[in-house]
């Protein structure tokens, strides 16, 4: 929620998701102030006693920072003056999920907004023709997912068709024992058709497309994070 009115400023956050083991961004913007020294940014997390991060008088102030975030956070200091209070989070962990508050004080007033942060693993799928198979077969692979996703195949020609009977999906635990590799095989594919392998959990949805003709193979893939709504 944004707060506006007398002695208050509008603060906007966007619900987002973090990919474990990678950098994450917690997005927050506010009405800018002309003087950097007048801006205070505080990031808080529900259930955590110390601060996630504090930036004031033009620099990081980490004396109240909670131990679990020590050395893992930074704001984009050169962008604070234009109203960017977003936080960079290092090495996202499953335990980083939760409700965060972006609290801003400027010479114009103060305001805050909450942000729901989900954590998991998601990756782009790659669809290939499996030449080792005895029949015309497609293989869809994505290296890292968590929690376990669902996999659904679709085709441009047979729209609405259910491919569950002619596909086989397996989940192989990766070496760190958290994320899993997703492998799905689709049998009895036909030429001159576009097939889509859709992988989805409650954090992200990814699609890998492959178009197979007699003369060429075209691939495309994309990934979208779910529930990215502004507050």
């Amino acid at each position: 929620f944004g707060i506006s009115g007398r002695h208050s400023i509008t603060v906007t956050t966007v619900a987002s998701a973090g990919n474990i083991g990678e950098d994450g961004i917690l997005s927050c913007t506010f009405e800018p102030d002309i003087k950097l020294s007048d801006i205070v940014i505080q990031w808080l997390k529900e259930g955590v006693i110390g601060l996630v991060h504090e930036f004031k008088e033009g620099k990081d102030e980490l004396s109240e920072q909670d131990e679990m975030f020590r050395g893992r956070t930074a704001v984009f200091a050169d962008q604070v003056i234009v109203g960017n209070a977003s936080l960079r989070l290092k090495n996202v962990q499953l335990t980083d999920a939760g409700t965060y508050k972006c609290y801003i004080i400027t010479s114009k007033g103060k305001g805050n907004a909450n942000l729901e942060y989900k954590t998991g693993a998601f990756s782009m799928p790659e669809v290939n023709v499996d030449y080792n198979a005895s029949s015309e077969t497609l293989r869809c692979e994505a290296p890292r997912w968590f929690p376990q996703p669902t996999v659904v195949w679709a085709s441009q020609v047979d729209q609405g068709a259910n491919f569950s009977e002619v596909s086989n999906t397996s989940f192989e635990l990766n070496s760190e024992n958290v994320t899993m590799k997703v492998v799905s095989v689709l049998y009895n594919v036909t030429i001159n058709n576009t097939y889509s392998c859709m992988i989805e959990n409650d954090i992200a949805k990814a699609t890998g497309d492959i178009k197979v003709t007699e003369s060429e193979i075209k691939r495309r893939s994309h990934l979208q994070l779910l529930n990215s709504k502004a507050s």
Epitope: D23, E61, L62, K90, N91, E176
Partner: antibody, heavy 121, light 107 residues
């Protein structure tokens, strides 16, 4: 331009202590972690620990806990490594390095020239 | 603590060769692996960080890749100035750790 200038070579006797300094310039000293790494003759790099000058927070390699002390003087933008109870195996070049990413502990992107510490009776 | 096992410890190659050095983390997984080049008597120089991001000013013949516990530094076409020792660094966790190093020598 980021610069880290370290103190000169030291010769110490076993059991003594040594304090190596690292003077930073070209950036806001209190906003970036400073790490310490050593390299024994003909050997690889070994991480000792790091310090956040803005608050004095430290992390140490278990191997050096209790013997290494990292401090800083924000008025002179200088970081210090003190190593006590020296033994011959501590003979090495000691490097300080700035960690990229400001308060976020990143990789070491700028290095001092190194300080040779020789421990010999 | 996480250990980084680097291989090979040394290799001989010629100018123009493609060279690959690997590092394996003992546990965990994250993208926080950096690669350094060190020449005798000099401080290490950062080449690559966050698995594959090239440090500004570093030639594009250097590249990094990897995921999970396995990481790779590749020099696509070895140049005379590339003969040096290379180290990986894991910096994702509270305690940082270097690999043992790989010395790249002239064949």
């Amino acid at each position: 331009e980021v610069q880290l200038v370290q103190s000169g070579a030291e010769v110490k006797k076993p059991g003594a202590s040594v304090k190596v300094s690292c003077k930073a310039s070209g950036y806001t000293f209190t906003s970036y972690w400073i790490g310490w790494v050593r390299q024994a003759p003909g050997q690889g790099l070994e991480w000792i620990g790091d310090i956040y000058p803005g608050g004095g927070y430290t992390n140490y390699n278990e191997k050096f806990k209790g013997r290494a002390t990292l401090t800083r003087d924000t008025s002179t933008s200088t970081a210090y490594l003190e190593l006590s109870s020296l033994r011959s195996e501590d003979t090495a070049v000691y490097y300080c390095a700035r960690l990229d990413g400001s308060s976020y502990r990143g990789a070491m992107d700028s290095w001092g020239q190194g300080t040779l510490v020789t421990v010999s009776s | 603590d996480i250990q980084m096992t680097q291989s090979p410890s040394s290799l001989s190659a010629s100018v123009g060769d493609r060279v690959t050095i690997t590092c394996k983390a003992s546990q965990g997984f994250n993208k926080y692996v950096a690669w350094y080049q060190q020449k005798p008597g000099k401080a290490p120089k950062l080449l690559i960080y966050y698995t594959s991001t090239l440090q500004p000013g570093v030639p594009s013949r250097f590249s990094g890749s990897g995921s999970g516990r396995d990481y790779t530094l590749t020099i696509s076409s070895l140049q005379p100035e590339d003969f040096a020792t290379y180290y990986c660094l894991q910096y994702g966790n509270l305690l940082y750790a270097f690999g043992q190093g790989t010395k790249v020598e002239i064949k």
